[in-house]
């Protein structure tokens, strides 16, 4: 069976301070079944910025209907962008399970905040 | 309904250490940013640390930076504050913060916990 | 680091007279600006978020404008439960967080 992949196409993203930036990522299938997070940073210093299945992103909305049936675009959009949102994030794909269990990462898109103009 | 309730404050000596608790409730805690703030008797807020959702990230004020230690057990609910080699000028209400989103503001405070540090 | 300049320091205002608080920060927040509510003997509570939205259950006498360094707090029709010191909080560069030196309000 073909191998999972997460695809980030943008390796870097510019947006002005204020604005809203969106951050694509999508899958190559459906199995196995689990959520997708974003994270921004990688590693164990790294900083949840959307879970479908809990918390509350006030200022992230996902691009696509995640909860529709066979949706492989997990893109967000992430609004009022401010200088302490840049960075890479990172699209990652779990396992479900107890917990779940982390499975594939896309290769990340930087983020980057411009002053906005005055 | 959105509770946090801070224990482990008292008095103790200069030099002395002591472990603030947050116990939180009414929120998926582990998806969120905290916080804790002080607050010097007659004084305004003062910022103090911060640690990310999953507990890998954190930050500190200069004024604590190397005595302060923050971390936090999802399992449990609960922020800790570990506040070693403590000073005169720590002495404050130390209160616990939950942010609105990871890149916010503080929406949610404790009700706070004493911390008197005295010899 | 930005630094949130508060004033004046105390204001003194009869019921029902508007009350007008200022918070001044060295460098553009943007919009990202809150104002906390702190009762003597008290924790801080949530007012203000965006510089402008009310927070949950915050009655609607309270009202915050401005963006880029200069904001305001309008308490429109102060009421005595109202006196308490006012902090303003910038959350658009960090860490660290920042909050202003307060402004003490009393309603004579």
């Known amino acids: 069976e073909e191998e999972l992949q997460v695809i980030q196409p943008e390796k870097s993203v510019s947006v002005a301070a204020g604005d809203s930036a969106t951050l694509n990522c999508t899958v190559s299938s459906l199995i196995p079944v689990g959520p997708i997070q974003w994270f921004r940073g990688a590693g164990p210093g790294r900083e949840l910025i959307y879970n479908l299945k809990e918390g509350h992103f006030p200022r992230v909305t996902a691009v696509s209907d995640p909860t529709k049936r066979n949706n492989m675009d997990f893109s967000i959009r992430i609004s009022n962008i401010t200088p302490a949102d840049a960075g890479t994030y990172y699209c990652v794909k779990f396992r479900k399970g107890s917990p779940d269990v982390e499975l594939k990462s896309g290769a990340g898109t930087e983020l980057s905040v411009r002053a906005k103009p005055s | 309904d959105v509770q946090l309730v801070e224990s482990g404050g008292g008095v103790v000596r200069p030099g002395e250490s002591l472990r603030l608790s947050c116990a939180a409730s009414g929120f998926s805690f582990r998806s969120y940013a905290m916080n804790w703030v002080r607050q010097a008797p007659g004084e305004g807020l003062e910022w103090v640390s911060r640690i990310n959702s999953g507990g890998g990230g954190t930050d500190y004020a200069d004024s604590v930076k190397g005595r302060f230690t923050i971390s936090r057990d999802n399992s449990k609910n609960t922020l800790y504050l570990q506040m070693n080699s403590l000073r005169a000028e720590d002495t404050a209400v130390y209160y616990c913060a939950k942010q609105y989103d990871w890149n916010s503001f503080f929406d949610y405070w404790g009700l706070g916990a004493l911390v008197t540090v005295s010899s | 680091e930005t630094v949130l300049t508060q004033s004046p320091a105390t204001l003194s205002v009869s019921p029902g007279e508007r009350a007008t608080l200022s918070c001044r920060a060295s460098q553009t927040v943007g919009s990202k600006l809150a104002w906390h509510q702190q009762k003597p003997g008290q924790a801080p509570r949530l007012l203000i978020y965006?510089?402008?939205n009310r927070a949950t259950g915050i009655p609607d006498r309270f009202s915050g404008s401005g963006s880029g360094t200069d904001f305001t707090l309008t308490i429109s029709s102060p009421q005595t439960e109202d006196s308490a010191v006012y902090y303003c909080?910038?959350?658009?560069?960090?860490?660290?967080?920042?909050f202003g030196g307060g402004t003490k309000v009393e309603i004579k």
């Open positions: 965006d510089a402008s």
């Open positions: 909080q910038q959350y658009y560069y960090w860490p660290p967080y920042r």
